[in-house]
Amino acid sequence: SGTTNTVAAYNLTWKSTNFKTILEWEPKPINQVYTVQISTKSGDWKSKCFYTADTECDLTDEIVKDVKQTYLARVFSYPAGHVESTGSTEEPPYENSPEFTPYLETNLGQPTIQSFEQVGTKVNVTVQDEWTLVRRNDTFLSLRDVFGKDLIYTLYYWKSSSSGKKTAKTNTNEFLIDVDKGENYCFSVQAVIPSRRTANRKSTDSPVECMGHEKGESRETGHHHHHH
């Protein structure tokens, strides 16, 4: 494979949220195209995104086969169109990515509050379980299925009339909290993997949801479901 006029990719970067995983790189191609290969440490190199003029490649299908494996990718550069033929048979230039372990490194997507319901002085807040592209026995798994008890949610809640926040934690997708009678509350949740010690330990906060807004009043004896 001749390599005339081709430059190796650089700045290979993994972008991954809830296991949706894209490899990005530079430069924008001029008279060249790319093919990406991905491998586990012990596995073989599998080509993806053949002869692409893009500078990104969706590798989700490969990494979801085993999210606890460590993956390495490499990007090959090939000349596109007419180039001066040197008769060279050297290997095409390529660049390796950093290693990537999806289970440890995928970012946690912004969670969503699925519903809340009040009964007396208790409110049950339910976090929507996000689906991932990870499969088991031909069934897509949720974020909770994949992470199990490694994943917790932190609930931030406060009276609509004040700014003092309280917090609660759960290793399921539900919170049951005590509230003051006759008060409206606002809620926001955050996904957290406490065992991680890196910047991707926490998700961004969910959108804020408040009792008594838009969808009707939440009565002490009634139910208020907030669906998205």
Epitope: S1, V33, K46, S47, A53, A80
Partner: antibody, heavy 121, light 107 residues
């Protein structure tokens, strides 16, 4: 139905050029790569290169670099393969072949009927 | 370039026989291998893609498997219409390359 129809047989002198066409129908032309594969008489198959019809980007096998040009005309859903500086060993059947879906991007799932190019003085 | 060594180059078998063709890659190509059937005077036809997936409309007597860099193509019960030359093709590395072909004849 999905099909690729190629231009007719050609006889060329050494040093000349030949341009073979391949008209696609029955599918969205821009969505599938097109490849060219040749087969010398009694011999095996040899991949020459690929063209992405949506952007016109081409990649050629090193063996053919500088002699082959692949182009496309999106208005007629046609791809072309031009081979220059012909020599006797270029005598072969030339096939266009569609690259498969994303599932099998570099499997050739639809083939043209082939164009016989004879190079003879 | 990746060399695809196909064997045997030809074989003769009876109708109903199990026929096996092998293709060995000169280096690891993952499962990026396809199998084609070419009848005399005709264009090749895709039978198997990604080493073991049967192309739509292809009879189930055709199958493919992989063990490391060795790939096997099998016709479980040879039929008269299976007389053809069979080719493997790898696409894991540029340029794409084919095996030399196996000509299958009926005894």
């Amino acid at each position: 139905q999905v099909q690729l129809v190629q231009s007719g047989a050609e006889v060329k002198k050494p040093g000349a050029s030949v341009k073979v066409s391949c008209k696609a129908s029955g599918y969205t032309f821009a969505n599938y790569y097109m490849h060219w594969v040749r087969q010398a008489p009694g011999q095996g198959l040899e991949w020459m290169g690929i063209i992405n019809p949506s952007g016109g980007i081409t990649v050629y096998a090193q063996k053919f670099q500088g002699r082959v040009t692949m182009t496309r005309d999106t208005s007629t859903s046609t791809v072309y393969m031009e081979l220059s500086s012909l020599r006797s060993e270029d005598t072969a059947v030339y096939y266009c072949a569609r690259g498969g879906s994303k599932v099998a991007a570099l499997a050739f799932d639809i083939w043209g009927q082939g164009t016989m190019v004879t190079v003879s003085s | 370039d990746i060399q695809m060594t196909q064997s045997p180059s030809s074989l003769s078998a009876s109708v109903g026989d199990r026929v096996t063709i092998t293709c060995q890659a000169s280096q690891d190509i993952s499962n990026s291998l396809n199998w084609y059937q070419q009848k005399p005077g005709k264009a090749p036809k895709l039978l198997i893609y990604d080493a073991s997936n049967l192309e739509t409309g292809v009879p189930s007597r055709f199958s493919g498997s992989r063990s490391g860099t060795d790939f096997t193509f099998t016709i479980s019960s040879l039929q008269p219409e299976d007389i053809a030359t069979y080719y493997c093709q790898q696409y894991n590395f540029h340029p794409l390359t084919f095996g030399g072909g196996t000509k299958v004849e009926i005894k």
